[in-house]
Interface confidence: low
Amino acid sequence: RAGGCNETGMLERLPLCGKAFADMMGKVDVWKWCNLSEFIVYYESFTNCTEMEANVVGCYWPNPLAQGFITGIHRQFFSNCTVDRVHLEDPPDEV
């Protein structure tokens, strides 16, 4: 981006996406959190939000900071899911 990436601004804005996603996931019973088809619309909305917020502050998306934030959200909601039950891609360094 011409004006450069405002990483601080992005880290301030991304939690808004996380909160909106958490609010939506509150409608999904916890035992369904490993079934992506139950909340795919919410998840797509979340990823679109992170992309938009990154772009607003002049950052490319995806980027390491945004992916780190998304990984944190994955941990919060999907840490108990086996790989074959939820198909969400974490950054390569998250094994």
């Epitope: 958490a22 609010d23 996931m25 509150g26 409608k27 019973d29 916890v30 035992w31």
Partner: antibody, heavy 115, light 111 residues
Framework: QEQLEESEGGLFKPTDTLTLTCTVS????????LTWVRQAPGNGLEWIGA???????YYASWAKSRSTITRNTNENTVTLKMTSLTAADTATYFC?????????WGPGTLVTVSS | DGVMTQTPSSVSAAVGGTVTISCQSS????????LSWFQQKPGQPPKLLIY???KLESGVPDRFSGSGSGTQFTLTISGVQCDDAATYYC???????????FGGGTEVVVK
Amino acid sequence: QEQLEESEGGLFKPTDTLTLTCTVSGFSLSVYALTWVRQAPGNGLEWIGAIGNSGNTYYASWAKSRSTITRNTNENTVTLKMTSLTAADTATYFCARGYVRINVWGPGTLVTVSS
Amino acid sequence: DGVMTQTPSSVSAAVGGTVTISCQSSQSVYKNNYLSWFQQKPGQPPKLLIYEISKLESGVPDRFSGSGSGTQFTLTISGVQCDDAATYYCLGGYDDDSDTSFGGGTEVVVK
């Protein structure tokens, strides 16, 4: 061990406001929904409302206008506040973990509304 | 409004027999599977038996089973035991959360 316990009920007068607190242990309110259910003496179960893991609240249509469910995730408590009590609100009130898969219940507390 | 009509209100069964309890919903439950079954004994809180129409809750004997779809649901107790004497309730959740409701209950008497 996952447990819930409702605060003590007791005797209330018509028009009073009921405040019940559910204290949970062994699980996080940030992960699980918490539901309130009541049961009038000799009657069936009645869904009052719930608070989702996100903090969103949901109420039965009959309870919406006079019920408020709040939570304190730091203290692991959920509070049900019900205004304008009448004799019809006499019941055992239960808090329970979950929304439809409600699989951990408190023992219940008896609330009596009488003049 | 979401109304769960549960039948029968009372049923008697012999030990080893089969009991079938029905719940008819006035509208489709949320995601077509937000339907649970509970057992309650006097002086105790309810106990979850079945969730998502047919999934057996952990620790519940497999003589309990749930079935159904759309607006019609059934709880079956096969090989009834004395310990199964209780009142059973269905619970349906809907798109509009304010419609979430229990059925009226079915008392099961074991002879």
